[in-house]
Interface confidence: medium
């Protein structure tokens, strides 16, 4: 029995619902009473959802999963996962058994956009060209870990004196804190760009020192 799932990972935003697509080709005369369907976590084999003996056996995964019962007879064994969390990320396997048996795994990639970075400048007054300043860039509650880039007003990357750290909170979302130490020119704009590598989303802010 051929079971089909998408090759590319399903990308889902934290807090939204995701559909993990899985399909099979039912033979003529197929009845749901013949169908055994199991969704499980690929690595741990933990049961997520099942359908057997013509009945939806329900969610075994925090009551956040559902099948599409009206579509099962047409070979649609997709799983709906509600209120996606970082901890849901990983591979899910769809097992379909009628008379024959088949399975395939689909990957779920979880993402969350980073907040617009906030920037602070220290010292923030009585600045002159030649002074060394510390510019702090903080962005919150994104996933996965961010890529942080600094650049000047002409778009030239600033890679020298940069310190970046990231830490996950208990929801698995990352906060990023990046510091640029720079010697001031006559006047200057400094930009911090926080990139989510999965969403290809850039959150950026600038500070201009005159």
């Amino acid at each position: 029995l051929e079971v089909q799932v998408p090759e590319d990972p399903v990308v889902a935003l934290v807090g939204t619902d995701a559909t993990l697509c899985c399909s099979f080709s039912p033979e003529p005369g197929f009845s749901l009473a013949q169908l055994n369907l199991i969704w499980q976590l690929t690595d741990t084999k933990q049961l997520v959802h099942s359908f057997a003996e013509g009945q939806d056996q329900g969610s075994a995964y925090a009551n956040r999963t559902a099948l599409f019962p009206d579509l099962l007879a047409q070979g649609n064994a997709s799983l709906r996962l509600q209120r996606v969390r970082v901890a849901d990320e990983g591979s899910f396997t769809c097992f379909v058994s009628i008379r024959d048996f088949g399975s395939a795994a689909v990957s779920l990639q979880v993402a969350a956009p980073y907040s617009k970075p906030s920037m602070t400048l220290e010292p923030n007054k009585d600045l002159r060209p030649g002074d060394t300043v510390t510019i702090t860039c903080s962005s919150y509650q994104g996933y996965p870990e961010a890529e942080v880039f600094w650049q000047d007003g002409q778009g030239v990357p600033l890679t020298g004196n940069v310190t970046t750290s990231q830490m996950a909170n208990e929801q698995g979302l990352f906060d990023v804190h990046s510091i640029l130490r720079v010697v001031l020119g006559a006047n200057g704009t400094y930009s911090c760009l926080v990139r989510n590598p999965v969403l290809q989303q850039d959150a950026h802010s600038s500070v201009t020192i005159t």
Epitope: S115, S138, Y140, Q141, T163, S165, M167, A168
Partner: antibody, heavy 116, light 107 residues
Amino acid sequence: EVQLQQSGPELVKPGASVRISCKASGYTFTSYYIHWVKQRPGQGLEWIGWIYPGNVNTNYNERFKGKATLTADKSSSTAYMQLSSLTSEDSAVYFCAGGTYFFAYWGQGTLVTVSA
Amino acid sequence: DIVLTQSPSHLAASPGETITINCRASKSISKYLAWYQEKPGKTNKLLIYSGSTLQSGVPSRFSGSGSNTDFTLTISSLEPEDFAMYYCQQHNEYPLTFGAGTELELK
């Protein structure tokens, strides 16, 4: 200049609740988490949790879940911590602090005394 | 939870001396340790974070070193205003935790 101005000392009875405030100035309120830290004499510092004023998400130390409730009012740039079902163990100085996962700016502390 | 053990708990020194305060974590925290200064009548002050990054405005006589489980705060050429309480704090994972503190007093 960044300042976190906390409310004054509180004397409360066992079993009661108290709400202390932390007013931020000198920076954009949504730029940092507001953390709360407990200090009992001779017992060092204990992290209670944070609130992110940008979206009022919270993150608590397991030890303080059910004890502390963190809220924030963006319009007044003020964060609040409510402590409930107070006992003598809750007598302490409570600090608010601004930062990501370390604390760049601190309030002056609020002394809470629980006594009959 | 990560336990931070600070030593010594008390330290007596004189202006001009160099002192070190140690902080040991119960498991690896990479480089993610901060140091604070506490003085009566003043708000707590962040000195160092990420093990060795000096907070803006903090004098260069303060320095931090270490990684994984063992960290050190060094104050070289002590000034009178440096006599205070010092705390370490890990920012590698939640819950955030602190050391019990080191009291630096005038000899």
